[in-house]
């Protein structure tokens, strides 16, 4: 059933989520900047076709439109999306030594955000009985593919986070 902003989500949870989204956006921007500065991979739109051939997926947030938000479905999609990005970021491991710490921080923050969402789902009795399982992740055959993949994953993640932020801000409105 659709659920407006006056939902059962505690304000403290929503504020924590908003902070975590902002932090991950900063991490993602740092990764994009370093990929641009180091490898001149600055325009994700130029790599879209490669993204298709590599099989880099998008995470949907179809249960989250503010007009007809389904709380359980939306939280579940948020969690599943973060779970997907954890796998994609993991697949980028070894992208380059200079990007290692940035990628590590991004992975940790995405995992933490997924945990925050899951904790709240458990508290509300909305947690699904089964954890989402990791689907097949793209296999990067070369260093270039991995770096290009990094640009695309970071770009997809930023889009996902922008929608997440709008949804959470909408829910946080009194």
């Amino acid at each position: 059933t659709p659920l407006g902003p006056a939902s059962s989500l505690p304000q403290s949870f929503l504020l924590k989520c908003l902070e975590q989204v902002r932090k991950i956006q900063g991490d993602g921007a740092a990764l994009q900047e370093k990929l641009c500065a180091t490898y001149k991979l600055c325009h994700p739109e130029e790599l879209v076709l490669l993204g298709h051939s590599l099989g880099i997926p998008w995470a949907p947030l179809s249960s989250c439109p503010s007009q007809a938000l389904q709380l359980a479905g939306c939280l579940s999609q948020l969690h599943s999306g973060l779970f997907l990005y954890q796998g994609l970021l993991q697949a980028l491991e070894g992208i380059s030594p200079e990007l290692g710490p940035t990628l590590d921080t991004l992975q940790l923050d995405v995992a933490d955000f997924a945990t925050t969402i899951w904790q709240q789902m458990e508290e509300l009795g909305m947690a699904p009985a089964l954890q989402p399982t990791q689907g097949a992740m793209p296999a990067f055959a070369s260093a270039f593919q991995r770096r290009a993949g990094g640009v695309l994953v970071a770009s997809h993640l930023q889009s996902f986070l922008e929608v997440s932020y709008r949804v959470l801000r909408h829910l946080a409105q009194p």
Epitope: Q90, E93, P101, D109, D112, T116, W118, Q131, Q134
Partner: antibody
Framework: EMQLVQSGAEARKPGSSVKVSCKAS????????ISWLRQTPGQGLEWMGW????????IYAQKFQGRVTMTRDTPITTAYMELSTLRSEDTAVYYC????????????WGQGTMVTVSS | DIQMTQSPFSLSASVGDRVTITCRAS??????LNWYQHKPGKAPKLFIY???SLQSGVPSRFSGSGSGTDFALTISSLQPEDFATYYC?????????FGQGTKVEIK
């Protein structure tokens, strides 16, 4: 009650390896990362790395890269940390902890495992 | 790596005293700072997270403050069970790093 129970104290010779286990209970194991930390007399508390129990993905601190391996056995909700090529400076108390130390802080700790490296 | 510097290294205080321990990060870490209490032979315990949030079960005489690079842990009225070593830890970037610890001893 949420708890992490670690394996017992170990004594090793320089150049050998040690594997410490950490059994989790009282919470959903796959939903929280497990970090490994150590306390040496000279270095204070050091974060060694983190494992995602769901995917098995790991992040290691640069200092331990190449010597540390973190694994997990999800059905028995247990995480493991193996440290190889031991030297006397690795003599320390090793802890597992729930969380990454970021937005999810180290909120549940194991009791610690003393590892002594000596010839 | 982000360096965390605590001061003082140790302090002697009496029961009932107000005690403040400071922690400085080598670069901005927003509010991603945690404080732990550690007693000999025991595992460390989380006391404060997100710079100022009190972990459940921790007495209200403990408080945390700060943002950016400068942080503090304050014990408003020191109790016998508070004598321990306190560590700050940054959770802003990888690798996670700790301060060197502040030992609070009985005067």
């Amino acid at each position: 009650e949420m708890q992490l129970v670690q394996s017992g104290a170990e004594a090793r010779k320089p150049g050998s390896s040690v594997k410490v286990s950490c059994k989790a209970s009282g919470y959903t194991f796959t939903n929280y990362g497990i970090s490994w930390l150590r306390q040496t007399p000279g270095q204070g508390l050091e974060w060694m790395g983190w494992i995602n129990p769901n995917s098995g993905g790991t992040i290691y601190a640069q200092k331990f890269q190449g010597r540390v391996t973190m694994t997990r056995d999800t059905p028995i909700t247990t995480a493991y940390m193996e440290l190889s090529t031991l030297r006397s400076e690795d003599t320390a108390v090793y802890y597992c902890s729930r969380g990454s130390g970021g937005a999810v802080p180290f909120d549940v700790w194991g009791q610690g495992t003393m590892v002594t490296v000596s010839s | 790596d982000i360096q965390m510097t605590q001061s003082p290294f140790s302090l002697s205080a009496s029961v009932g005293d107000r005690v403040t321990i400071t922690c400085r990060a080598s670069q901005t870490i927003s509010n991603r700072l945690n404080w732990y209490q550690h007693k000999p032979g025991k595992a460390p315990k989380l006391f404060i997270y997100y710079a100022s949030s009190l972990q459940s079960g921790v007495p209200s005489r403990f408080s945390g403050s700060g943002s950016g690079t400068d942080f503090a842990l304050t014990i408003s009225s020191l109790q016998p069970e508070d004598f321990a070593t306190y560590y700050c830890q940054q959770g802003y970037s990888s690798p996670r790093t700790f301060g060197q610890g502040t030992k609070v001893e009985i005067k």
